[in-house]
Amino acid sequence: SGTTNTVAAYNLTWKSTNFKTILEWEPKPVNQVYTVQISTKSGDWKSKCFYTTDTECDLTDEIVKDVKQTYLARVFSYPAGNVESTGSAGEPLYENSPEFTPYLETNLGQPTIQSFEQVGTKVNVTVEDERTLVRRNNTFLSLRDVFGKDLIYTLYYWKSSSSGKKTAKTNTNEFLIDVDKGENYCFSVQAVIPSRTVNRKSTDSPVECMGQEKGEFRE
């Protein structure tokens, strides 16, 4: 048959951050091509990345339609130049991915401190509300729009002159913290979804310190 040298895809892996979602697999193709299909548990299969020699497929457009759904993908293997050919059972070779629920599993991207403003002994630290590729009414939603109060941020802050750290949490994108007058502080934030059991925390944001560009000081 024409499928003699065709091998099934394996190690199907979802790579997803802030809902940007790519399915990856192995092996690098030798004389074969791949097509990916994706569906929800109750939905129809939709084909993507037709007859590709890549070993990844961007499925973001499909999963953002409903990030709370659970998705399954499968990767079909075809002989290069003979994509009509089927396996011995009359079906092309394919392998299923693990199930993937974007809302529960997408990684939280590294947050960014948008600004901080000092007024006397208070500092307001604002976290950038990152835009996702999830849409509602033709507009892209932010991370906060999607997760609502399920998303919190943890702030770490410390005096530039010392190593002793403090922490604060917020269920918005802003922190209002007390600081000692005349001291410079450094800040780093982390996104957290406390209700999750996996992929709960982001990596820390880059550290921002008072006396640098992003800050503003008022007596």
Partner: antibody, heavy 117, light 107 residues
């Protein structure tokens, strides 16, 4: 099943130091925050400090700064509390607890430390 | 630092009574408040998280309410196993602070 298993009872001399351990099972400590809480006999609960095992950040109540040192070893899924220059004031039960972000949701069984000459 | 004032420090009640314990924070803690039950010789047990959410396995007679600076734990109908000490904890900002505790005793 999520569990926090703490090390055993300690009887130590004044001026000594002690290192308490708290081994997590059923979860990965670097996905959470780990805290230590002190309870003296017949007294309330006092937060000593906490640690984010993912990045090594540790925070302390100012009254325990210099007394306590909180660390974590992600390879063994264990959090540690070291107490130095022990006095009778440090005689207490010490609890470790996991912080989900919403609460300290799981607690160890407690470790008793008695400082006596 | 945020102070947590818990009241009453003790109360006597009968089985079936409705019991209310309050915690007042010295500043807004944005619902980062949890409630714990502790029995002698045991570790604290989580009852309520994020001010109003019931922890897994906790009977529905326990409920939490409040926001901003004022929070309440209610036991709608006290049961024999509920006689214990109760603590609130604010974890919105370090240093985290516990309330002083409320000992619920049998009348």
């Amino acid at each position: 099943e999520v569990q926090l298993q703490q090390s055993g009872t300690n009887l130590v001399r004044p001026g000594a130091l002690v290192k308490l351990s708290c081994k997590g099972s059923g979860f990965n400590i670097k996905d959470y925050y780990m805290h230590w809480v002190k309870q003296r006999p017949e007294q309330g609960l006092e937060w000593i400090g906490g640690n984010d095992p993912a990045n090594g950040h540790s925070m302390y109540d100012p009254k325990f700064q210099g007394k306590a040192s909180i660390t974590a070893d992600t390879s063994s899924n264990t959090a540690y509390l070291q107490l130095s220059s022990l006095t009778s004031e440090d005689t207490a039960v010490y609890f470790c607890a996991r912080d989900s972000g919403y609460a300290m949701d799981y607690w160890g069984q407690g470790t008793s430390v008695t400082v006596s000459s | 630092d945020i102070q947590m004032t818990q009241s009453p420090s003790s109360l006597s009640a009968s089985v079936g009574d409705r019991v209310t314990i309050t915690c007042k924070a010295s500043q807004d803690i944005k619902s980062f408040l949890s409630w714990y039950q502790q029995k002698p010789g045991k570790a604290p047990k989580l009852l309520i998280y994020y001010a109003t959410s019931l922890a897994d396995g906790v009977p529905s007679r326990f409920s939490g309410s409040g926001s901003g600076t004022d929070y309440t734990l209610t036991i709608s109908s006290l049961q024999p196993e509920d006689f214990a000490t109760y603590y609130c904890l604010q974890h919105g900002e370090s240093p985290y602070t516990f309330g002083g505790g409320t000992k619920v005793e049998i009348k």
